[in-house]
């Protein structure tokens, strides 16, 4: 399977909410011995290998924000901890998964990574990730709502096996 990032850049005004999205593509094994671990984290922009460094989002680590379920099942993060930080990650039946960030500030700007790990019991795991940039705008040049920029076809199938 692969991870696609429909949008490579999100430009949002301060105070707005945004939902960053990744999509699972390709055949997904729905067997009983397969589960999917999905999560989000921030990463440095200057890396040779994108998303190799895992930094917290609003002081929450990728472990705090993870979803763990089978196949194309729907799931949400536990509300209490994430929502106190203005965050919610979610996954639907169609392979889409997302993180919603509320009340954006300049400090939320940066590179965000989604990670999917396929875990097969007694077998090796398969990891893929996608990356996107969030730019929170202030002042006269800020849009009134979030503006999204589609990934190039090359970027949108942003598969990196770890």
């Amino acid at each position: 399977f692969k991870v696609a990032t429909p949008y490579s850049l999100y430009v949002c005004p301060e105070g707005q909410n945004v939902t960053l999205t990744c999509r699972l593509l390709g055949p997904v094994d729905k067997g009983h011995d397969v589960t999917f671990y999905k999560t989000w984290y921030r990463s440095s922009r200057g890396e040779v290998q994108t998303c190799s460094e895992r930094r917290p989002i609003r002081n929450l680590t990728f472990q705090d924000l993870h979803l763990h379920h089978g196949g194309h099942q729907a799931a949400n993060t536990s509300h209490d901890l994430a929502q106190r930080h203005g965050l919610e990650s979610a996954s639907d039946h169609h392979g889409n998964f997302s993180i919603t960030m509320r009340n954006l500030t300049l400090l939320d700007s940066g590179l965000y990574c989604c990670l999917v790990v396929e875990i097969r019991h007694h077998h090796s795991e398969h990891r893929v990730h996608g990356a996107m940039e969030l730019q929170v705008q202030t002042g006269k040049d800020a849009p009134s709502n979030c503006v999204v920029y589609p990934s190039s076809s090359q970027d949108s199938e942003n598969i990196t096996a770890a």
């Epitope: 850049l9 430009v11 301060e14 921030r42 990463s43 440095s44 922009r45 200057g46 930094r55 609003r58 002081n59 929450l60 930080h85 203005g86 500030t105 300049l106 400090l107 939320d108 700007s109 940066g110 590179l111 940039e133 730019q135 929170v136 705008q137 202030t138 002042g139 040049d141």
Partner: antibody, heavy 122, light 111 residues
Framework: QVQLVQSGAEVKKPGASVKVSCKAS????????MHWVRQAPGQGLEWMGY????????GYNQKFKDRVTMTRDTSTSTVYMELSSLRSEDTAVYYC???????????????WGQGTTVTVSS | DIVMTQTPLSLSVTPGQPASISCRAS??????????MQWYLQKPGQPPQLLIY???NVESGVPDRFSGSGSGTDFTLKISRVEAEDVGVYYC?????????FGQGTKLEIK
């Protein structure tokens, strides 16, 4: 090592514009936001705004409204700050300063340019 | 804008003695558990030098006699034993909200 080298001192008349440059070296230029801070003679520090060199998007202190423009040239790893409709109160040392982390827009600075003195006088 | 108020505005300290500077923000500078408050020292003719970031983190290369504390709206910079090289103007800065704002500065001199 990280270096931010600014252009030389300028003397301008009221109503004119000034464009100050800041050339970065010693790190990946597009990975860190660049901010501008000014300091009037004998006064404190005033944050003017920032530019994300990766995307070219700026953000400004509303105090400067339509007078300030920040741009960048990735081919030369240089950022620019242009201030228009100059008045005597704009006489100050103008500093570029690099954001601390390469993963957010946090406005705190371990690296500063040497400063550019802009004098506005008729 | 968040207003930063420093006290005192000037300070005269005997070498080897401690010094303390306070900074109060007009509203909280907390960002999901981190206090976005910095301290800088500016020496004459030089750009500011970062001493403390995120309220209590001492910047690399800064002597360990400098420390920062506080949360919410009230913050303190302490120098355990002042040395001659510590003279200059100290500024606090908040980076929680745009525009980032600085205190008016505290001038430290040696007795």
């Amino acid at each position: 090592q990280v270096q931010l080298v600014q252009s030389g001192a300028e003397v301008k008349k009221p109503g004119a514009s000034v464009k100050v440059s800041c050339k970065a070296s010693g790190y990946t230029f597009t990975s860190y936001w660049m901010h501008w801070v000014r300091q009037a003679p004998g006064q404190g520090l005033e944050w003017m705004g920032y530019i994300n060199p990766s995307t070219g998007y700026p953000g400004y202190n509303q105090k400067f409204k339509d007078r300030v423009t920040m741009t960048r040239d990735t081919s030369t790893s240089t950022v620019y700050m242009e201030l228009s409709s100059l008045r005597s109160e704009d006489t100050a040392v103008y500093y570029c300063a690099r954001s601390y982390y390469d993963y957010d827009g946090g406005a705190w600075f371990a690296y500063w340019g040497q400063g550019t003195t802009v004098t506005v006088s008729s | 804008d968040i207003v930063m108020t420093q006290t005192p505005l000037s300070l005269s300290v005997t070498p080897g003695q401690p010094a303390s500077i306070s900074c109060r923000a007009s509203e909280s500078v907390e960002y999901y558990g981190t206090s976005l408050m910095q301290w800088y020292l500016q020496k004459p003719g030089q750009p500011p030098q970062l001493l403390i970031y995120a309220a209590s983190n001492v910047e690399s290369g800064v002597p360990d006699r400098f420390s920062g504390s506080g949360s919410g709206t009230d913050f303190t910079l302490k120098i355990s034993r002042v040395e001659a090289e510590d003279v200059g103007v100290y500024y606090c800065q908040q980076s929680r909200k745009v525009p980032s704002t600085f205190g008016q500065g505290t001038k430290l001199e040696i007795k």
